[in-house]
């Protein structure tokens, strides 16, 4: 990388280097030869995240009920605030600027991840021996019932989407 | 006390490597910028570069850029400067310097080298 | 890069004599500058940084002043040790560069 003509958490302004402000704080005036950097803390509703010469402090995010968000971490001068979801919404970005709500699994389809506030259900198909018949953002796929284990035979083959159906073994020879 | 101990004198062939070492001892080794600086035979000063021993990061002299790393390990407290495709004008004494400590400085680099290494000798020659 | 001019790069003098090294640069470095003192086969030792502050253990007869871009060190009254090499080196901004060097040699 280019040389630098400042150390570390410094900046080159009118041919001399100053010190940066720390996080949570911004700048109001530059170093001079006989002043050092002078820095101001952020007020209750900013932040600044690093080491910076910004004259003014970044706004914390606004977590919007109307778009489904709540705040997950309040932020402080240092730190943005979190947004997450309502239960049963999604954030739609990884900065979860807005919400959607939580898709179901169709027939034929379990759950394989239960939906959060900042990912979507994952589904999955049902393999052969389960089955799901219903449209669920919770349910798994369920085992095809053993009819031998209730001395039963199969009279109806199950699909991914359908049960298998028991009955009684014919007793005829 | 301070002491900034090197690796002993090294001949090398142009084109190959160089690797010097600097223990430092008698104070924290992460809270000052270790520099190095050469000085050819009969020479003045020159500036290579710096290393951060806190965070490892450093900046290099335009003029050895591409051939300069500059490296450290704190576990022993020692800092390490290797040079590359070495030439005869290489041939100099390498000493590691002890800067101002980490936050001493508000306005300026303020570099100011109160402990040096003893000097390696690089003689480089076929 | 600021360049740092350094004169005279020799200097004949006796030992009691009052001795003056200058340096300048090539812009303004405002008080950012170290002087230091090197003796053949040693490394450099730091004698005055921020132009004018003397390092500690370093005699008093040694002094600097300066601002800006004129820089001076000053032997009061030259003693049988300080005859050496004196270096300015500018501490400004990066990257660091340093006179060429003034030779105070015994006459």
């Known amino acids: 990388e280019p040389p630098t003509a400042c150390r570390e958490k410094q900046y080159l302004i009118n041919s001399q280097c100053c010190s940066l402000c720390q996080p949570g704080q911004k700048l109001v005036s530059d170093c001079t030869e006989f002043t050092e950097t002078e820095c101001l803390p952020c007020s209750e509703s900013e932040f600044l995240d690093t080491w910076n010469r910004e004259t003014r402090c970044h706004q914390h995010k606004y977590c919007d009920p109307n778009l489904g968000l709540q705040v997950q971490q309040k932020g402080t001068s240092e730190t943005d605030t979190i947004c997450t979801c309502e239960e049963g919404l999604h954030c739609t970005s990884e900065s979860c600027e807005s919400c959607v709500p939580h898709r179901s699994c169709l027939p034929g389809f379990g759950v394989k991840q239960i939906a959060t506030g900042v990912s979507d259900t994952i589904c999955e198909p049902c393999p052969v021996g389960f089955f799901s018949n219903v449209s669920s953002a919770f349910e798994k796929c369920r085992p095809w019932t053993s009819c031998e284990t209730k001395d039963l035979v199969v009279q109806q083959a199950g699909t991914n989407k359908t049960d298998v159906v028991c009955g009684p073994q014919d007793r005829q020879r | 006390q301070v002491q900034l101990v090197q690796s002993g004198a090294e001949v090398k062939k142009p084109g190959a490597s160089v690797k010097v070492s600097c223990k430092a001892s008698?104070?924290?080794?992460?809270?000052?910028?270790m520099h190095w600086v050469r000085q050819a035979p009969g020479q003045g000063l020159e500036w290579m570069g710096w290393i951060n021993p806190d965070s490892g990061g450093t900046n290099y002299a335009q003029k050895f850029q591409g051939r300069v790393t500059m490296t450290r390990d704190t576990s022993i407290s020692t800092a390490y400067m290797e040079l590359n495709r070495l030439r005869s004008d290489d041939t100099a004494v390498y000493y590691c310097?002890?800067?101002?400590?980490?936050?001493?400085?508000?306005?300026?680099?303020?570099?100011?080298?109160?402990?040096w290494g003893q000097g390696t000798l690089v003689t480089v020659s076929s | 890069d600021i360049q740092m001019t350094q004169s005279p790069s020799s200097v004949s003098a006796s030992v009691g004599d009052r001795v003056t090294i200058t340096c300048r640069a090539s812009?303004?470095?405002?008080?950012?500058l170290a002087w230091y003192q090197q003796k053949p086969g040693k490394a450099p030792n730091l004698l005055i940084y921020t132009a004018s502050t003397l390092q500690s253990g370093v005699p008093s007869r040694f002094s600097g002043s300066g601002s800006g871009t004129d820089f001076t060190l000053t032997i009061s009254s030259l003693q049988p040790e300080d005859f050496a090499t004196y270096y300015c080196q500018q501490a400004n901004i990066f990257p660091l560069t340093f006179g060429g060097g003034t030779k105070v040699e015994i006459k």
């Open positions: 310097a002890r800067d101002q400590p980490l936050g001493y400085c508000t306005n300026g680099v303020c570099s100011y080298f109160d402990y």
């Open positions: 812009q303004g470095i405002y008080s950012w």
């Open positions: 008698g104070y924290t080794f992460t809270g000052y910028y």
